[in-house]
């Protein structure tokens, strides 16, 4: 099966790479604009220059194109803890990231929030913190993992999943309680 092509892709595929079909005259292939510029006017005829203009401040194009407008620069989401890694230029969008010792949690494909990497107190680092993943901790004896923190088994209720990990401690507490009821 041939994948369905959109109108723009169909039109572009008729021209050699780096060119696009003139929207009013499909016998003309115009040269695409370089990154950092946008299409101001189509080329008037074969072999003639496309009128490309540089993107204005606050906008960019990251690849060769025949866009009528540059794209607006992204803004880092301060409320999500994001910081600007590199500023927007005419040919590259803003790059946002997290501070040192933080990782990204993606709420959706493009929206992320910065969180502090777990320190594994009362445990050891099993896997180091990565750009998009928190530290993976292994807890010391007498502690269990809850929301990636090592919590004392004294906080383990019988209904929780920690009962298997904290079984000796729970049995000891139970034994102490039983021995006190004679």
């Amino acid at each position: 099966l041939v994948p369905h092509l959109g109108d723009r892709e169909k039109r572009d595929s008729v021209c050699p790479q780096g060119k696009y079909i003139h929207p009013q005259n499909n016998s003309i292939c115009c040269t695409k604009c370089h990154k950092g510029t946008y299409l101001y006017n189509d080329c008037p005829g074969p072999g003639q220059d496309t009128d490309c203009r540089e993107c204005e401040s606050g906008s960019f194009t990251a690849s060769e194109n025949h866009l009528r407008h540059c794209l607006s620069c992204s803004k880092c989401r301060k409320e999500m803890g994001q910081v600007e890694i590199s500023s927007c230029t005419v040919d590259r969008d803003t790059v946002c990231g997290c501070r040192k010792n933080q990782y990204r949690h993606y709420w959706s494909e493009n929206l992320f929030q910065c969180f502090n990497c777990s320190l594994c107190l009362n445990g050891t680092v099993h896997l180091s913190c990565q750009e998009k993943q928190n530290t993976v901790c292994t807890c010391h004896a007498g502690f269990f993992l809850r929301e990636n923190e090592c919590v004392s088994c004294s906080n383990c209720k019988k209904s929780l999943e920690c009962t298997k990990l904290c079984l000796p401690q729970i049995e000891n507490v139970k034994g102490t309680e039983d021995s006190g009821t004679t």
Partner: nanobody, 119 residues
Framework: EVQLLESGGGLVQPGGSLRLSCAAS????????MGWVRQAPGKGLEWVSL????????YYADSVKGRFTISRDNSKNTLYLQMNSLRAEDTAVYYC????????????WGQGTLVTVSS
Amino acid sequence: EVQLLESGGGLVQPGGSLRLSCAASGFTFSDYTMGWVRQAPGKGLEWVSLIDRPGNHTYYADSVKGRFTISRDNSKNTLYLQMNSLRAEDTAVYYCAKWGLNVEDFDYWGQGTLVTVSS
């Protein structure tokens, strides 16, 4: 059909507390990020809080940080918002909302519950 039913709103004095609940049905609750959105009288929608599927990650608007706590019980298909130290500016209709998978926003809202903070 996705259904989100909020409860727990009402009139409360400044400094008081309320706990909102949201009963979800019509979709696999544990598969989705959930959140609370509010709309104050005459204002636009404001994200209040988000919570991921297992409940490990949360987001709070700066205006509620340290006062509100979002939580969820996947076994009960229920979302909660514990609201403490309430202020007059928290007066709004609060909507429980389901996060969309392919959008950077919520795709379903409940009918809302009114929270009024006044002395």
